[in-house]
């Protein structure tokens, strides 16, 4: 089950996952000037079973300069491909975390990918927070957040982390020295949804995709 919202924002902190639960989707985003190739996927998908998980699909980008003017570009939809990529490994992932049953490692970068990675997490996913460079962590509790399902709605637990403006940085589990989050800050358009919409996608199906008719013009 996909989490309806993004993990909570903590001032002066970034988050990342050590491993991605089966069912997680990663958008195939290309950097400016590039687009998804005709046979490319819309998403990568962490799939598999308790003993082995890997990423379905491969993200591929091509120069926008070659774009067909008739807009016949046809990306492969996210939901469908069953072609397996090789097992993903990343030096950014502690082995014990990435080897969790039913989890995938961080996918390696693809050529001309966007600067920020957009993940769609699933229930049970845990993300870890660290203060950005120049800020120090004051822990009141776990510096992590978990996507949980409660009464048919998904929500992220609140990480107990405060980042203060001192020149020391906290570290992610398993890291020997501070480093910037590899995926940067995910798009956080919906970060305020917890308070504003109460996860309408779960509770108001008809309202989630409201369709209506606009005025008709005579021609």
């Amino acid at each position: 089950e996909l989490c309806d919202d993004d993990p909570p924002e903590i001032p002066h902190a970034t988050f990342k996952a050590m491993a991605y639960k089966e069912g997680t989707m990663l958008n195939c985003e290309c950097k400016r000037g590039f687009r998804r190739i005709k046979s490319g996927s819309l998403y990568m998908l962490c799939t598999g079973n308790s003993s082995h998980s890997s990423w379905d699909n491969q993200c591929q980008c091509t120069s926008s300069a070659t774009r067909n003017t008739t807009k016949q570009v046809t990306p492969q939809p996210e939901e469908q491909k069953e072609r397996k990529t090789t097992e993903m490994q990343s030096p950014m992932q502690p082995v014990d975390q990435a080897s969790l049953p039913g989890h995938c490692r961080e996918p390696p970068p693809w050529e001309n990918e966007a600067t920020e990675r957009i993940y769609h997490f699933v229930v049970g996913q845990m993300v870890y927070y660290q203060c950005v460079q120049g800020y120090r962590a004051l822990h009141r509790g776990p510096a992590e957040s978990v996507c949980k399902m409660t009464h048919g709605k998904t929500r992220w637990t609140q990480p107990q982390l405060i980042c203060t403006g001192e020149m020391e940085t906290s570290q992610f589990p398993g890291e020997e020295k501070p480093q910037a989050s590899p995926e940067g800050r995910p798009e956080s358009e919906t970060s305020c949804l917890v308070t504003t919409t109460d996860f309408q996608i779960q509770t108001e199906m008809a309202a989630t995709m409201e369709t209506s008719i606009f005025t008709t013009e005579y021609q």
Partner: antibody, heavy 104, light 110 residues
Framework: PGESLKISCKGS????????IAWVRQMPGKGLEWMGI????????TYSPSFQGQVTISADKSITTTYLQWSSLKASDTAMYYC??????????WGQGTLVTVSS | QSVLTQPPSASGTPGQRVTISCSGS????????VSWYQQLPGTAPKLLIQ???RRPSGVPDRFSGSKSGTSASLAISGLRSEDEADYYC???????????FGGGTKLTVL
């Protein structure tokens, strides 16, 4: 017939710009037909060959709304039109549908 | 003519198990995920099965999906009167570069 029409689909409760939205047609008493998809983040659009050139799919991410538009309606466009979020594995959330009736 | 082939109708009595088939080709069912949808009379379709055999939360475990080669099937066990609806299968088609649906199966609970 001959008139233009634009119907809309508003998404809420999720990150609208980061999921693909599909439009699906269902003619009276018939089955489902996939028309095309749009990625609201950059308005990248893909059409089914059957609907290419017949309709235009667009999006306004500032108001989290996707549109399906006809420049010149035909009687055969009479149908129920659904929007749905396309995710890894299927179309997981559907709008309640908009009934378009074209009659002279 | 639908790209995926489903029987137009199926029926069963309460408590029975019914199976609905969906036949395709190597360019759709054979190489891509299959999803199933339930459309109750007068309502929008609802995702029932995704990625061949995964049930979204809220879908009873009486519904199950499977796939073998270029065919897929939806099984409904412990049939109930509220299961009376139209059922559609769907898959991405590599040749057509789009999602294709089956023609739909009308399930009647006798």
């Amino acid at each position: 017939p001959g008139e233009s029409l634009k119907i809309s689909c508003k998404g809420s409760g999720y990150s609208f710009t980061t999921y693909w939205i599909a439009w699906v047609r269902q003619m009276p008493g018939k089955g489902l037909e996939w028309m095309g998809i749009i990625y609201p983040g950059d308005s990248d659009t893909t059409y089914s060959p059957s609907f290419q050139g017949q309709v235009t799919i667009s999006a306004d991410k500032s108001i989290t709304t996707t549109y399906l538009q006809w420049s010149s309606l035909k009687a055969s466009d009479t149908a129920m039109y659904y929007c749905a979020r396309q995710v890894a594995g299927g179309l997981d959330y559907w709008g309640q549908g908009t009934l378009v009736t074209v009659s002279s | 003519q639908s790209v995926l082939t489903q029987p137009p109708s199926a029926s069963g009595t309460p408590g029975q198990r019914v199976t609905i088939s969906c036949s395709g080709s190597s360019s759709n069912v054979g190489s891509n995920y299959v999803s199933w949808y339930q459309q109750l009379p007068g309502t929008a379709p609802k995702l029932l099965i995704q990625r061949n055999n995964r049930r979204p939360s809220g879908v009873p475990d009486r519904f199950s999906g499977s796939k073998s080669g270029t065919s897929a099937s939806l099984a409904i066990s412990g049939l109930r009167s509220e299961d009376e609806a139209d059922y559609y299968c769907a898959a991405w088609d590599d040749s057509l570069s789009g999602v294709v649906f089956g023609g739909g199966t009308k399930l009647t609970v006798l």
